[in-house]
């Protein structure tokens, strides 16, 4: 049984996205703009002595000896997501002493590229989807995740980083895009906005959603996080945009409800697992995928994305702590913690359903829909 | 045998105080999560308060009724498990029970020993 | 925090019979739920753990059964000894809560 979540199942950008709303100067779309230096780093921050790599935080990277089987949070760099252009974030200010890459903030100095110069590289995260231009790829079938299911004991960490809040995941969580394209998940963490702002990592043609969960994976052909950065699909990220509905999410809730025992940057606290599945659409088999980076230093490419189509909802009250709870350093809210979205460059997004016929109801006129490329091999 | 004892107990005013111990034995102290449980006269069950494993740093967890008023602790040491209760209500009268909870191969909460529990009376 | 209905708050049966005790919860809580049987005068003891597990020593009379929100304890062949009130309790998330009990008479 699955908990009842989410209930938008059109095309993204469709129906309760919020399109009737005008869309503030944050909405729109930068995925044609270059990257400013000024942007939030992406989405993992890279681990320093205690903090992995972007994508939030890693699991901190042990030596291969250390408990070889089993993948710890820590190994997977942290990547934190920059606000957008016009809205430098204050929040997120990486101080602690270690790796270069922890000393980054949102929407400030020092500029991302001179912190990871990965940051500033040609396929980076997050962009802007647009249906209508997505490739369809039949070849992209139903993800697979086995073991999300999560027994109340052993509990889990939930960690208020200074930029995210972040849930280590255990051994054990595998899943797969498709054949051979087999993962483990490590953490996950969330981007939010601020009260009436939001505060997603990806837009769907300029729309910017209230919050975007993130569940970062690592390669079955990989050990170790360090050893999968900027590797090709070392690492795969799925995301989902959370959004505004009727009703209290029982399983956010269960994340949520333990918020304010971490309210201030570098706390945590033990919640009992979970059914991680349930912090997820519903719907594992229209999505959309491409190639980019961790959304914070060290900005590494190579990940897969694989952003579902029907969205998570929340209630607005759900959505209130969650934007409204934590701190991050110097006395800041943790706020606005998401990576203007980088350029395309020419890469093209691919999805498992045909999402560009007829589907978005932000469709102006017909496009030339990119053909799909050899998805899976 | 494993056996948990409870001690402590009283009649006390309200907003008193009272330090109620459960000496255990039988078991690794260490590798259990362990609760406090009430029962106030002919009702339900209550669940207080846990202390967790070594393992997972001995950290507490407290219900609503009781967080800020109630401490649990435990003396290593000497196998037991300690409740601080402060500004004590009338409403706080009940039996109370030190109870074993899961250990680090248990996948759920559930109490599986119970000791004899130890009467608190809140009363002026 | 999870609510626990309970249901019959008590019921009457005669030896031999076969009873069922119901547990519903308000959310999914997957199998991570108790049955416990307290005695009069007595404390509390677990009968049956993760919805359909026997604890040691309890007879092979009491079962569990159930999934998700909704869960049953029955006892067959009822026994004198079976005089008790019994408790569901989840264990999927804190605050852990227990049913409200259901007291078990004989005929």
């Known amino acids: 049984q699955r908990l009842p979540r989410m209930q938008e199942d059109s095309p993204l950008g469709g129906g309760s996205s919020g399109e009737d709303d005008p869309l503030g100067e944050e909405d729109l779309p930068s995925e044609e703009d270059s990257p400013r230096e000024e942007d939030p780093p992406g989405e993992e921050d890279l681990p320093g002595e205690e903090d992995l790599p972007g994508e939030e935080d890693l699991p901190e990277v042990k030596p291969k000896s250390e408990e070889e089987g089993s993948l710890k949070l820590e190994d997977l760099p942290t990547v934190e997501a920059p606000g957008d252009p016009q809205e430098p974030q204050n929040n997120a200010h990486r101080d602690k002493e270690g790796d270069d890459q922890s000393h980054w903030r949102y929407g400030g100095d020092p500029p991302w590229p001179r912190v990871s110069p990965a940051c500033a590289g040609r396929f980076q995260s997050p962009v802007d989807i647009r249906p209508q231009l997505a490739a369809f790829c039949p070849a992209l079938r139903p993800l697979e995740l086995l073991g999300f299911q999560l027994p109340p004991l052993p509990e889990l960490r939930l960690r208020n980083n200074g930029h995210s809040v972040q849930l280590t995941l255990p051994p054990g969580l595998e899943m797969a895009l498709g054949p051979g394209r087999e993962y483990r998940a490590l953490q996950l963490h969330l981007h939010w906005g601020a009260a009436g702002r939001p505060g997603s990592e990806h837009t769907v043609e300029g729309h910017r959603f209230p919050a975007e969960i993130h569940v970062v994976h690592l390669s079955t052909a990989f050990a170790r996080v360090d050893e999968a950065l900027g590797r090709p699909g070392g690492l795969a990220v799925l995301a989902a945009f959370l959004e505004e509905g009727p009703e209290e999410n029982s399983a956010y809730e269960q994340l949520l409800s333990r918020l304010e025992e971490i309210a201030e940057e570098g706390s945590e606290t033990q919640v009992p697992g979970l059914d991680i599945s349930a912090l997820l659409p519903s719907d594992f088999s229209r999505y959309f995928q491409y190639e980019g980076s961790l959304t914070t230093p060290p900005c590494a490419q190579g990940v897969i994305w694989t952003v579902f189509n029907q969205t998570v909802m929340l209630s607005a009250k759900q959505l209130h702590t969650l934007s409204d709870t934590l701190w991050g350093p110097g006395d800041s809210r943790l706020q606005l913690n998401f990576r203007a979205t980088q350029p395309l460059n020419g890469r093209v997004i691919e999805a498992s359903f045909p999402a560009g016929v007829d589907s978005s109801p932000r469709a102006a006129e017909p496009v030339q829909l990119n053909s799909c490329l050899a998805a899976g091999d | 045998e494993v056996k948990l004892v409870e001690s402590g107990g009283g009649l006390v005013q309200p907003g008193g105080s009272l330090r109620l111990s459960c000496a255990t034995s039988?078991?690794?102290?260490?590798?259990?999560?362990m609760h406090w449980v009430r029962q106030p006269p002919g009702m339900a069950l209550e669940w207080l308060a846990f202390?967790?494993?070594?393992?997972?740093?001995?950290?507490?967890q407290y219900s609503a009724s009781v967080k800020g008023r109630f401490t649990i602790s435990r003396d290593v040491s000497q196998t037991i498990l300690y409740l601080q209760m402060n500004t004590l209500r009338p409403e706080d009268s009940a039996t109370y029970y030190c109870?074993?909870?899961?250990?680090?191969?248990?996948?759920?909460?559930?109490?599986?020993?119970w000791g004899a529990g130890t009467t608190v009376t809140v009363s002026s | 925090d999870i609510q626990m209905n309970q249901s019959p708050s008590s019921l009457s049966a005669s030896l031999g019979d076969t009873i069922t005790i119901a547990c519903h919860v308000s959310q999914n809580i997957n199998v991570w739920l108790s049955w416990y049987q307290q005695k009069p005068g007595n404390i509390p003891k677990l009968l049956i753990y993760?919805?359909?597990n026997l604890h040691t020593g309890v007879p092979s009379r009491f079962t569990g059964s159930g999934s998700g929100t909704g869960f049953t304890l029955t006892i067959s062949s009822l026994q004198p000894e079976d005089i008790a009130t019994y408790y569901c309790?989840?264990?999927?998330?804190?605050?852990?809560?227990f049913g409200s009990g259901t007291k078990l008479e004989i005929k």
């Open positions: 109870v074993r909870g899961g250990h680090a191969g248990s996948n759920y909460w559930y109490f599986d020993v």
């Open positions: 202390i967790r494993n070594k393992a997972s740093g001995y950290t507490p």
């Open positions: 993760q919805a359909s």
């Open positions: 039988g078991f690794t102290f260490t590798d259990y999560y």
């Open positions: 309790q989840q264990g999927q998330s804190y605050p852990f809560t």
